[in-house]
C-alpha cells in the first residue's frame, strides 16, 4: 500500500533511453503517443513529472515488517496526464486520470547502476518499463541479473 | 528488527591487506543497496564503497579506487570490504550501512556500529 | 564529483535555541540530500531524507529545506539530546558527505 497520498518530492526531469534516445510525447488524434527517438541538436527534449511514494512492501513476502520500504513513481508529461501499464497489452500508454490514481500508473523504481533508474510495473512485479522498436513496451523481468538489460535502463536529467 | 554487525577491523602494517565483513540480518538483504562508509579519528564521514543489490555494479571514490573491493553473498546475506595496499590514512572506523528503500540507491537508512581499522608500523 | 560544503563547522547553542546548519552542494542535486545525527562513539542515524522527510520516529523539531544546491537543516527547540555532529549528505549524483557540524553546549 502507498504509505502517504502526496508524494514524498517531485522531480521534472527528461528521460532518455541508456543509449540517449530520447522519450518524446506527441498529442496525436487527442490521445498522446510515446516515442522514443534521436532528437536533432538543439531541439527540447520533454520533461517529465516524477513523483516519488513511499510504499509498504507487503511484509509476508519480504519478512521486513515496517521496515520494507520501497519508492513508488508516477510519470506525468502534462497536466492531468500520467503513464499507464497495460498488461494486458504489455504496453505502455499515456492516459488522462484524476486523483487517487489507479495502480496502474504506480511504478517501483529501481536503480541497478548509479546513474540510472528502471521503473517496475506495480500492478505486474517482474514487469518493466522498456524500449521495444521505437516505443515503449512492458517487459518481463525474469531474474535480477537482467535488471541491468539495457533497454530497461533510463537516465534522468534535468537538462 | 534490521541488524548489521562488522568484523574484521584491526591492526595491519602499511601495504599490507585486511578484509571486513558485515552480518546483516531481519531485512531482505538482496534487495538492497549496501554501503561501506569509514570515519577517521576526530574527523568526518566518507562515503568509500557501495554495491548494487545483485552485485552487478560496484563504486568507488578516487581515494581507494583500485586498492578496495566491495562485494557482497547473497544466499549468506554477508558484505564484504577487501581492503588492499593500505595506507595510513585508511585508519578509520568502517561502518557498514544499507539503503533506505528496496531496490534503489538513495539514503542510508540503518547503520552498523562500526570496526576500527588502523593501519601503522 | 560533487563537493558538499557544511557551515558552520561547529557552533554553540543553549537549551531551546533555534539552530540552523546549511550545506551548498557544488551542483544541482535536485532534492537529492539527507541529513544525520552522530553522538559520540555512535554511528550515524538517518534524520531527514529527500530533503524534507522526516525518518520514523525523529522529533518534530527537526526540519530540512531547500532544493537544488541550497539545503537547510532547522532544529527549532534545541534540547539536550539535540547536542551532536550533523552531516549532510548527497546522493543525486555518487555520494558524497558535507563535512559536518559539531552543536556544542554554549
Known amino acids: 500500500s502507498i504509505t502517504g497520498i502526496s508524494p514524498i518530492t517531485e522531480y521534472l526531469a527528461s528521460l532518455s533511453t541508456y543509449n540517449d534516445q530520447s522519450i518524446t510525447f506527441a498529442l496525436e488524434d487527442e490521445s498522446y503517443e510515446i516515442y522514443v527517438e534521436d532528437l536533432k541538436k538543439d531541439e527540447k527534449k520533454d520533461k517529465v513529472l516524477l513523483s516519488y511514494y513511499e510504499s509498504q512492501h507487503p511484509s509476508n513476502e519480504s519478512g521486513d515488517g515496517v521496515d520494507g520500504k520501497m519508492l513508488m513513481v508516477t510519470l506525468s508529461p502534462t497536466k492531468d496526464f500520467w503513464l499507464h501499464a497495460n498488461n494486458k497489452e504489455h504496453s505502455v500508454e499515456l492516459h488522462k486520470s484524476e486523483k487517487p490514481l489507479p495502480d496502474q500508473a504506480f511504478f517501483v523504481l529501481h536503480n541497478m547502476h548509479s546513474n540510472s533508474v528502471s521503473f517496475e510495473s506495480k500492478t505486474d512485479p517482474g514487469v518493466f518499463i522498456g524500449v521495444k522498436d521505437n516505443h515503449l513496451a512492458l517487459i518481463k523481468v525474469d531474474s535480477s541479473e537482467n535488471l541491468s538489460t539495457e533497454n530497461i535502463l533510463f537516465k534522468l536529467s534535468e537538462t | 528488527e534490521v541488524q548489521l554487525v562488522e568484523s574484521g577491523g584491526g591492526l595491519v602494517q602499511p601495504g599490507g591487506s585486511l578484509r571486513l565483513s558485515c552480518a546483516a540480518s531481519?531485512?531482505?538483504?538482496?534487495?538492497?543497496?549496501m554501503y561501506w562508509v569509514r570515519q577517521a579519528p576526530g574527523k568526518g564521514l566518507e562515503w568509500v564503497a557501495a554495491i548494487t543489490p545483485n552485485a552487478g555494479e560496484d563504486y568507488y571514490p578516487e581515494s581507494v579506487k583500485g586498492r578496495f573491493t566491495i562485494s557482497r553473498d547473497n544466499a549468506k546475506n554477508s558484505l564484504y570490504l577487501q581492503m588492499n595496499s593500505l595506507r595510513a590514512e585508511d585508519t578509520a572506523v568502517y561502518y557498514c550501512a544499507r539503503g533506505h528503500y528496496y531496490y534503489t540507491s538513495y539514503s542510508l537508512g540503518y547503520w552498523g556500529q562500526g570496526t576500527l581499522v588502523t593501519v601503522s608500523s | 564529483d560533487i563537493q558538499m560544503t557544511q557551515s558552520p563547522s561547529s557552533l554553540s547553542a543553549s537549551v531551546g535555541d533555534r539552530v540552523t546548519i546549511t550545506c551548498k552542494a557544488s551542483?544541482?542535486?535536485?532534492?537529492?540530500l539527507d541529513w544525520y545525527q552522530q553522538k559520540p562513539g555512535k554511528a550515524p542515524k538517518l534524520l531527514i531524507y529527500f530533503t524534507n522527510n522526516l525518518q520514523t520516529g525523529v522529533p518534530s523539531r527537526f526540519s530540512g529545506s531547500g532544493s537544488g544546491t541550497d539545503f537547510t537543516l532547522t532544529i527549532s527547540s534545541l534540547q539536550p539530546e539535540d547536542f551532536a555532529t550533523y552531516y549532510c549528505?548527497?546522493?543525486?549524483?555518487?555520494?558524497?558527505f558535507g563535512g559536518g557540524t559539531k552543536v556544542e553546549i554554549k
Open positions: 549528505f548527497q546522493y543525486n549524483q555518487g555520494w558524497t
Open positions: 531481519g531485512f531482505t538483504f538482496s534487495s538492497y543497496w
Open positions: 551542483q544541482n542535486i535536485n532534492k537529492h
